[in-house]
């Protein structure tokens, strides 16, 4: 028995070959012996049943001369999954058609971090097929009647070429995924105390009309609980602020990419935030983490102190030195001090490996008065 795979809604070609490689009488039937179509010697295609009943069934008249009498079934339905019989030259050939339906749950337009389940449904009780989907960038996902893609990323967007294999027979179909998300999962902003702060949240996709709502929650390092800094709506790509905290005095841009500014980086703002964006007609939310690290350098009571506040990595080093001189103190911690510093220009550096994340300078005056 020959096996043919077909996808619901598409076409399938069931083979039937003459050993003589020339035109001959043939008939295609269902397994219950009802005639579908055939050729009875005059080179004319004869259809069984009413025209509306079998209007999806056809053959390739151009192939008859070569001894090929395929049955073409268009607009495949799940109920077409059955055994078909081709009668010619006093023999019968059985062809089994396996029609499968592909469903994508929750759909092919998803949010970053969500999962996609691809399911093959069929009426026939076939053994497990192999389903394999390959992205144009090379990523391959495989399964059987159920194929899962978890924690989708923006890079997973675009066309996937999928193959269903059963008993060495293959059928291809494509799917176009659209994974909506931010360009970066998280970002860190390093600022000296008093500097202006800008946070940007660029999206990794473009749509003509983008509608939804969002909020930025902030967990300051020095605070016991998080606080909603701003809530906003997004309508046709226009951002409108709904509610904003009075401290800090935040401003938000009215057009994409989402953009927020703080007039000053202050120690009490150092910490991390989570911007969430809920898009209309989508379940779930997009998230982007943003971190603010603030450096403060001050001279008090004959002690020069450099401190960083906010989420730093344990590998980061804080260095306090007089400009153009060797490091006076350099430690893997968030505060460094020099007692009785010499007069002159001092520099504090926050670095990770050989990369300087930020630096701040302070002028130490002889009278113990400081000038940043």
């Amino acid at each position: 028995k020959t096996l043919v795979l077909g996808k619901e809604g598409e076409s399938a070609e069931l083979p039937c070959e003459s050993s003589q490689k020339k035109i001959t009488v043939f008939t295609w039937k269902f397994s219950d012996q009802r005639k579908i179509l055939g050729q009875h010697g005059k080179g004319v295609l004869i259809r069984g049943g009413s025209p509306s009943q079998f209007d999806r069934f056809d053959s390739k008249k151009g192939a008859w001369e070569k001894g090929s009498f395929p049955l073409i079934i268009n607009k495949l339905k799940m109920e077409d999954s059955q055994t078909y019989i081709c009668e010619l030259e006093n023999r019968k050939e059985e062809v089994e058609l396996w029609v499968f339906k592909v469903t994508f749950s929750p759909g092919t337009s998803l949010l970053q971090g969500q999962s996609l389940t691809l399911t093959l449904d069929s009426n026939s009780k076939v053994s497990n097929p192999l389903t394999e989907c390959k992205h144009k960038k090379g990523k391959v996902v495989s399964g059987s009647k159920v194929l899962s893609m978890s924690n989708l990323r923006v890079q997973d967007s675009d066309f996937w070429n999928c193959t269903v294999t059963l008993d060495q027979k293959k059928n291809w179909f494509g799917m176009t995924l659209s994974v909506l998300g931010f360009q970066k999962a998280s970002s860190i902003v390093y600022k000296k105390e008093g500097e202006q702060v800008e946070f940007s949240f660029p999206l990794a996709f473009t749509v003509e009309k983008l509608t939804g709502s969002g909020e930025l929650w902030w967990q300051a390092e020095r605070a016991s609980s998080s606080k909603s800094w701003i809530t906003f709506d997004l309508k046709n790509k226009e951002v409108s602020v709904k509610r904003v905290t009075q401290d800090p005095k935040l401003q938000m841009g009215k057009k994409l990419p989402l953009h927020l500014t703080l007039p000053q980086a202050l120690p009490q703002y150092a910490g991390s935030g989570n911007l969430t964006l809920a898009l209309e007609a989508k379940t779930g939310k997009l998230h982007q983490e943003v971190n603010l690290v603030v450096m403060k350098v001050a001279q008090l009571n004959n002690t020069l102190t450099c401190e960083v506040m906010g989420p730093t990595s344990p590998k980061m080093r804080l260095t306090l030195k007089q400009e153009n001189q060797e490091a006076r103190v350099s430690e893997e911690q968030k505060v460094v001090q020099v007692v009785a510093p010499e007069t002159g220009l001092w520099q504090c550096l926050l670095s990770e490996g050989d990369k300087v994340k930020m630096d701040s300078r302070i002028q130490v005056l002889s009278r113990g008065v400081n000038q940043t």
């Epitope: 202006q196 702060v197 800008e198 309508k235 046709n236 790509k237 226009e238 409108s240 602020v241 401003q251 938000m252 841009g253 009215k254 057009k255 953009h259 500014t261 703080l262 007039p263």
Partner: antibody
Framework: EVELLESGGGLVQPGGSLRLSCAAS????????MSWVRQAPGKGLEWVSG????????YYADSVKGRFTITSDNSKNTLYLQMNSLRAEDTAVYYC????????????WGKGTTVTVSS | AIQMTQSPSSLSASVGDRVTITCRAS??????LGWYQQKPGKAPKVLIS???SLQSGVPSRFSGSRSGTDFTLTISSLQPEDFATYYC?????????FGQGTKLEIK
Amino acid sequence: EVELLESGGGLVQPGGSLRLSCAASGLTFSTFAMSWVRQAPGKGLEWVSGISGSGENTYYADSVKGRFTITSDNSKNTLYLQMNSLRAEDTAVYYCAKEGYNWNYMDVWGKGTTVTVSS
Amino acid sequence: AIQMTQSPSSLSASVGDRVTITCRASHGIRNDLGWYQQKPGKAPKVLISETSSLQSGVPSRFSGSRSGTDFTLTISSLQPEDFATYYCLQDYTYPYTFGQGTKLEIK
């Protein structure tokens, strides 16, 4: 060519009301954000109010909030500014301006209509 | 609201001079700033949008730039028709705010 024509200005007593209109031609009104900008005699430009293309979002300068209302009628391609509780400091030439497709700038301006608030 | 501080308020210059006008924003406003020219009795006209995009029909002697929250309009070689009042406008967020204006006069 896109044209904006303001009307409705005039002399009004303090505490009175006026409604300014801005008729637009040569554009699909609902596509663009619109603004009202004013200029007091011998002074600089002051942005007064704005409305999104859909008409869903409206915005005001602090100096007019609660007294002025911006609306639009897309079927008439007309922008309005309802001015209530007028004060002497509202005396100015009022311009209506159309914003670019992506709110990039005010690319088309009307010639202005004069509002005088005086007793 | 975001404050825009424009300087100088007035400026005397001669034809052929290079002139710069600056605006400082009280908050970061990305590149969401435009420059407008206004002549007496006329409506303003946009010269530059988004910090540095020259509008069609505007002579190339006009240019715009940004450094942090400082924005600059430069006229490389003043022409007689350039004597006017110039304004910056932040359209980063509502309420929009104009600078106080710079009146450019013939020396």
